[in-house]
């Protein structure tokens, strides 16, 4: 049979050695020997390492720069990184969430689609024929046009993708 | 220091299952495949498998195939044998053992002290 | 049957040195270096003497050798001491996913 040519899955090779890697969480103050044990040390306050590695120095825990528009959205630990989102009314400009925009608004004619979120810009669609959007707005929707036959009244003019239609009374000799 | 403390003697009926544990201490557990050996009476030791502590992975030697589990838990850091339809020829010492490799070789470096199995009706 | 032959005894004199063969093959023994000792007293855990053939953990005596020749190691014991009385398995390494064949054994009586 072959030898083995590469160490076990949680281990690196040095000096011939296979020494187990440190956990997540933990750095690596010194190597493992023949007579001894790889040496870890948990990452300090405000610090992570998020795999098993032979990393001598911990990361950083992102900064979320309220200047920049930022807050925190979940508490970095020694095992994973701080996670920024986006202060209300403001969506990040890239995935890694480095700095915000403010939430764009529909023009008139146009409808929310999606609501932004921390991570999203809103999405805008046009108002199909039968809704209309008269505002520039990041939440409303198109709205349908008033349905004039309901209330028993004719429509007088003509609804378009940023007005509504106007009703008014039926014409009396048409009776 | 790498310790591996087991559990106590086991007495057990024919047909029966036992579970034995190794506790480890001193190292970072999942970085190690876990070896089971055992030594009936009077003699020599006999290699059951391995399991690797961080997939939960396992190897048996073919004798055992089918009537042994290896598993582990590592939040307790613990390994442990479950052997099933015992026999009386399964009364041994059940030994875990700590692997240890270099480039071309491994080998045990540490051993737990042994769990009695005494099987009998 | 073990895939590795030992003698099932030896003995020797205080002060003397003795040698304990462990015979395999050549897809074992005798084509890498995967031999390991251990020592047993009775009643304890085996531990670890000598591996990769002839080096030697941390705390083991250097009165304990290991060598190869051809498809037989050797466990060399110098100096012998009262305390070496035990029984010794060699081990070898047979492949990443089936691991371990253990010899018999040798029993060391120490006269």
């Known amino acids: 049979p072959e030898p083995p040519t590469a160490c076990r899955e949680k281990q690196y090779l040095i000096n011939s050695q296979c020494c187990s890697l440190c956990q997540p969480g933990q750095k690596l103050v010194s190597d493992c020997t023949e007579f001894t044990e790889t040496e870890c040390l948990p990452c300090g306050e405000s610090e992570f390492l998020d795999t098993w590695n032979r990393e001598t120095h911990c990361h950083q825990h992102k900064y979320c720069d309220p200047n920049l528009g930022l807050r925190v959205q979940q508490k970095g630990t020694s095992e994973t990184d701080t996670i920024c989102t986006c202060e209300e009314g403001w969506h990040c400009t890239s995935e890694a969430c480095e700095s915000c925009v403010l939430h764009r608004s529909c023009s008139p004619g146009f409808g929310v689609k999606q609501i932004a979120t921390g991570v999203s810009d809103t999405i805008c669609e046009p108002c199909p024929v039968g809704f209309f959007s008269n505002v520039s707005s990041a939440f409303e929707k198109c709205h349908p046009w008033t349905s004039c036959e309901t209330k028993d009244l004719v429509v007088q003019q003509a609804g378009t993708n940023k007005t509504d239609v106007v009703c008014g009374p039926q014409d009396r000799l048409r009776a | 220091q790498v310790q591996l403390v087991q559990s106590g003697t086991e007495v057990k009926k024919p047909g029966a299952s036992v579970k034995v544990s190794c506790k480890a201490s001193?190292?970072?557990?999942?970085?190690?495949?876990m070896h089971w050996v055992r030594q009936a009476p009077g003699q020599g030791l006999e290699w059951m498998g391995w399991?690797?502590?961080?997939?939960?992975?396992?190897k048996y030697t073919q004798k055992f195939q089918g009537r042994v589990t290896l598993t582990r838990d590592a939040s307790v850091s613990t390994a442990y044998i479950d052997l099933n339809r015992l026999r009386s020829d399964d009364t041994a010492v059940y030994y875990c053992?700590?692997?240890?490799?270099?480039?071309?070789?491994?080998?045990?470096?540490?051993w737990g002290q042994g769990s009695l199995v005494t099987v009998s009706s | 049957q073990s895939a590795l032959t030992q003698p099932a005894s030896v003995s020797g004199s205080p002060g003397q040195s003795i040698t304990i063969s462990c015979t395999g093959t050549?897809?074992?023994?005798?084509?890498?270096?995967?031999v390991s000792w251990y020592q047993q007293h009775p009643g304890k855990a085996p531990k670890l003497m000598i591996y990769?053939?002839?080096r030697r953990p941390s705390g083991v005596s250097n009165r304990f050798s290991g060598s190869k020749s051809g498809n037989t190691a050797s466990l060399t014991i110098s100096g012998l001491q009262a305390e070496d009385e035990a029984e010794y398995y060699c081990?070898?390494?047979?492949?990443?996913?089936?691991?371990?064949?253990f010899g018999g054994g040798t029993k060391l009586t120490v006269l």
């Open positions: 053992a700590r692997e240890r490799c270099r480039t071309t070789n491994c080998y045990l470096d540490y």
């Open positions: 001193g190292y970072t557990f999942p970085g190690y495949y």
């Open positions: 399991i690797n502590p961080d997939s939960g992975g396992t």
């Open positions: 050549s897809s074992d023994v005798g084509n890498y270096n995967l």
């Open positions: 990769e053939v002839n």
């Open positions: 081990c070898s390494y047979a492949g990443r996913d089936t691991f371990v064949v």
